[in-house]
């Protein structure tokens, strides 16, 4: 029933809608185009079950992981999928059901002592020591299958670019920080202000990709120097 759907205590959240440029107090300020959402997690009562959209494993239940439903499918369309049982193929720990972890591409049973050491190794590899409490709790005190992060996909919240997958950078998006695509040749880029300069940049673009730099477009003639278009160009 609708009541059971909408009044569940389990709170779920929606993958981020990606927004655009915004001003700062004094101009029209764009809000992050997210929406308040008290949703639900597990429901047995819905006839028309809809897969739950996600961007990170943490958004799924403890017996689910976040992935594209089709092999080699569109990375932008991800849903919560049922976790994989022992001896099933996996690519990361979160794919395996609680009590198991991913070793050599197969979900295997967690040996508590051996497993704890492996957790520490994985965290350090992925995020460095300063991220041991990335999601607000110590990732080393629980054996939840959700404690393993893959690199953030486009739209995932991040703290720094090393949290994001290859080809993405971590940049301001309205009032948050998300993984955004690194810019390609010819794409419009932003000459970031020096620290200490004023003005609230609510929407920021990524930096230019390897071998490219953000320069004034040669054929872009404008009277005002400050309003000239910058694009990613070969060195």
């Amino acid at each position: 029933t609708l009541n059971s759907v909408l009044n569940s205590n389990a709170i779920k959240n929606l993958p981020p809608p990606l927004g655009g440029a915004a001003g700062h107090p004094g101009s029209a300020v764009s809000a992050a185009p997210g929406i308040l959402y008290p949703g639900g997690n597990k429901y047995q009562t819905i006839d028309n079950y809809q897969p739950y959209p996600c961007a990170e494993d943490e958004e799924c239940g403890t017996d689910e992981y976040c992935a594209s439903p089709t092999r080699g499918g569109d990375a932008g369309v991800q849903i919560c999928l049922a976790c994989r049982k022992r001896r099933k193929r996996c690519m990361r720990h979160a794919m395996c059901c609680p009590g198991n972890y991913c070793k050599n591409g197969i979900c295997v049973s967690s040996d508590q002592n051996h497993f704890r050491g492996e957790i520490e190794e994985t965290i350090t590899e992925s995020f460095g020591n300063d991220h041991s409490t990335l999601d607000g709790y110590s990732r080393r005190t629980t054996l939840s299958s959700k404690m393993y992060h893959t690199k953030g996909q486009e739209g995932s919240v991040c703290l720094r670019s090393s949290d994001c997958a290859s080809g993405l950078c971590c940049d301001r998006h309205f009032w948050s920080k998300i993984c955004k695509p690194v810019l390609k040749e010819g794409q419009v880029c932003t000459k970031h202000r020096r620290k200490g300069s004023h003005g609230l940049e609510i929407f920021q673009r990524c930096y230019c990709g390897e071998g490219l730099s953000c320069r004034i477009q040669k054929d872009h003639h404008q009277a005002s120097n400050s309003s000239r278009l910058h694009t990613c160009q070969r060195h």
Epitope: G19, G20, A21, A31, A32, P33, W175
Partner: antibody, heavy 114, light 112 residues
């Protein structure tokens, strides 16, 4: 579990102050912009304030500007709303809200009455 | 601020029959990222809002498919294909393309 839990509401006299807290858990709090939204009894929702992921940028609704202050402690995964010079019209349920993959708590009731 | 105007303000529907609510915004909610930031939610007495639709036409997970949203730019519609007793409450539209987030006045839906 991914959740937001508001606290600090109560009955207060006009002109007095109150500080609301919102404890976040289960997600990367320090990466998200956070909002406060309120709902007066029998009325619709009203957006109150927003703070950027790092706490450096803040923006307020005109109705609370100069009286309310939004802040956050990323080390404690907590969002705050300091409410000064409270008025009867500030009586509402206050919700803290996470933007982007948005979620919010159940709210905390603030009653301003003499 | 972007003004959101809903019609009708109240609606009495026979169970099993359809219902339709309109929402107009004072300016376009289409963003330059191609998304339109219009949402629908339902509120029942003493409860927090229950969000139904995001970005005009996308149902939040586990919302029954009798709820659908449509529209573009400044004109939007929420439809309930077959109203059920539990669908009663106040339905609101909301925009989040610009601060402050703003809301429609609400449409009270009741069962005949």
């Amino acid at each position: 579990q991914v959740q937001l839990v508001e606290s600090g509401g109560g009955v207060v006299q006009p002109g007095r102050s109150l500080r609301l807290s919102c404890a976040a858990s289960g997600f990367t709090f320090s990466g998200y912009g956070m909002h406060w939204v309120r709902q007066a009894p029998g009325k619709g929702l009203e957006w109150v304030a927003v703070i950027s992921y790092d706490g450096n940028d803040k923006y307020y609704a005109d109705s609370v500007k100069g009286r309310f202050t939004i802040s956050r402690d990323n080390a404690k995964n907590t969002l705050y709303l300091q409410m000064n010079s409270l008025r009867a019209e500030d009586t509402a349920v206050y919700y803290c809200a996470r933007e982007l993959r948005v979620l919010w708590g159940q709210g905390t009731l603030v009653t301003v009455s003499s | 601020d972007i003004v959101m105007t809903q019609t009708p303000l109240s609606l009495s529907v026979t169970p099993g029959q359809p219902a339709s609510i309109s929402c107009k915004s004072g300016q376009s909610l289409l963003h330059n990222d191609g998304k339109t930031y219009l949402y629908w939610y339902l509120q029942k007495p003493g409860q927090p809002p229950q969000f139904l639709i995001y970005e005009v036409s996308n149902r939040f997970s586990r919302v029954p498919d009798r709820f659908s949203g449509s529209g573009s730019g400044t004109d939007f519609t929420l439809k309930i294909s077959r109203v059920e007793a539990e669908d009663v409450g106040i339905y609101y539209c909301m925009q989040s393309i610009q601060l402050p987030w703003t809301f429609g006045q609400g449409t009270q839906v009741e069962i005949k």
